[in-house]
């Protein structure tokens, strides 16, 4: 297993619709053809997997049908979008990149993007 540098923004504020997008960029030492991207969430010192996708270079990322993540790839960049976020989902979202094929296997883990999610204010009651 060889180390690889992964860069991601330090902080992002999700939209009022609970959508957060950020780029995860990796410094590929070679010509990988198969890449696996995993998003981990760290909160209260607990780490959980949010979503993961394996893709062939030049192809779209394919997450599971029920995943809250979508993404596109361009060269050594992966543009990740996480949807359906609520205030309770605020936390540190860490991008993990694995170059699966061809060997050697490379692993890179970013420092994480602190995603803040603000629940929208409830609309005031209106009289008609």
């Amino acid at each position: 297993c060889k180390a690889m540098h992964v860069a991601q923004p330090a902080v992002v504020l999700a939209s009022s619709r609970g959508i957060a997008s950020f780029v995860c960029e990796y410094a590929s030492p070679g010509k990988a053809t198969e890449v696996r991207v995993t998003v981990l969430r760290q909160a209260d010192s607990q780490v959980t997997e949010v979503c993961a996708a394996t893709y062939m270079m030049g192809n779209e990322l394919t997450f599971l049908d029920d995943s809250i993540c979508t993404g596109t790839s361009s060269g050594n960049q992966v543009n990740l979008t996480i949807q359906g976020l609520r205030a309770m989902d605020t936390g540190l979202y860490i991008c993990k990149v694995e170059l699966m094929y061809p060997p050697p296997y490379y692993l890179g883990i970013g420092n994480g993007t602190q995603i803040y999610v603000i629940d929208p204010e409830p609309c005031p009651d209106s009289d008609f």
């Epitope: 923004p9 330090a10 902080v11 992002v12 504020l13 999700a14 939209s15 009022s16 997008s21 950020f22 909160a43 209260d44 205030a87 309770m88 605020t90 936390g91 602190q114 803040y116 603000i118 629940d119």
Partner: antibody
Framework: QVQLVQSGAEVKKPGASVKVSCKAS????????ISWVRQAPGQGLEWMGW????????NYAQKLQGRVTMTTDTSTSTAYMELRSLRSDDTAVYYC?????????WGQGTLVTVSS | EIVLTQSPGTLSLSPGERATLSCRAS???????LAWYQQKPGQAPRLLIY???SRATGIPDRFSGSGSGTDFTLTISRLEPEDFAVYYC?????????FGQGTKVEIK
């Protein structure tokens, strides 16, 4: 090294607007947020809101909602805070700061005086 | 909004003594998203602690933070002359983010 340099002191009349700038250097501007905090003379700190320089999304203190606008110009690594319909109790030192989990780097502060 | 109440309002101590500052929240602060700042007259605040217990870059280890939920503490193990200042807590787990009213640590 990380630096945040704010615009100079302002004197405004009640009802006017003020726009304070905060120029960042020494780091990747779009990777961080910019938080705005104010401090009235002899008083404590008051959080005004923040902007994610990555995507321009904002989160404002409810008491200032409708009067405050925070923006960024990523081409110049500058953040702006505009406060409208100024009142005498808006007289304060206004600080910008680089935000992730707390403000680790601060601007020098901009004194805004509202007086007729 | 979450109201943060700091106590005591003023703490009179001598250099070398231990200072214990309290910050109590009106409701639970999610994920211990609480920070502590130090401010001296005429200066911008300085971040000491984030995440309730993590020291910011360059902060001496005599400063430590602890607590979770609604009760948080900033401890200065041995006061140095430069530590006499006003200290603020801030929660950033629930919008609007809020500050406590501050605790002044003065020389006895």
């Amino acid at each position: 090294q990380v630096q945040l340099v704010q615009s100079g002191a302002e004197v405004k009349k009640p009802g006017a607007s003020v726009k304070v700038s905060c120029k960042a250097s020494g780091y990747t501007f779009t990777s961080y947020g910019i938080s705005w905090v104010r401090q009235a003379p002899g008083q404590g700190l008051e959080w005004m809101g923040w902007i994610s320089a990555y995507n321009g999304n904002t989160n404002y203190a409810q008491k200032l909602q409708g009067r405050v606008t925070m923006t960024t110009d990523t081409s110049t690594s500058t953040a702006y805070m505009e406060l409208r319909s100024l009142r005498s109790d808006d007289t304060a030192v206004y600080y910008c700061g680089r935000w992730v989990r707390g403000v680790e780097y601060w601007g020098q502060g901009t004194l805004v005086t509202v007086s007729s | 909004e979450i109201v943060l109440t700091q106590s005591p309002g003023t703490l009179s101590l001598s250099p070398g003594e231990r200072a214990t500052l309290s910050c109590r929240a009106s409701q639970s602060v999610s994920s211990s998203y609480l920070a502590w700042y130090q401010q001296k007259p005429g200066q911008a605040p300085r971040l000491l602690i984030y995440g309730a217990s993590s020291r910011a870059t360059g902060i001496p280890d005599r400063f430590s933070g602890s607590g979770s939920g609604t009760d948080f503490t900033l401890t200065i193990s041995r006061l140095e002359p430069e530590d006499f200042a006003v200290y603020y807590c801030q929660q950033y787990g629930t919008s609007p983010w809020t500050f406590g009213q501050g605790t002044k640590v003065e020389i006895k």
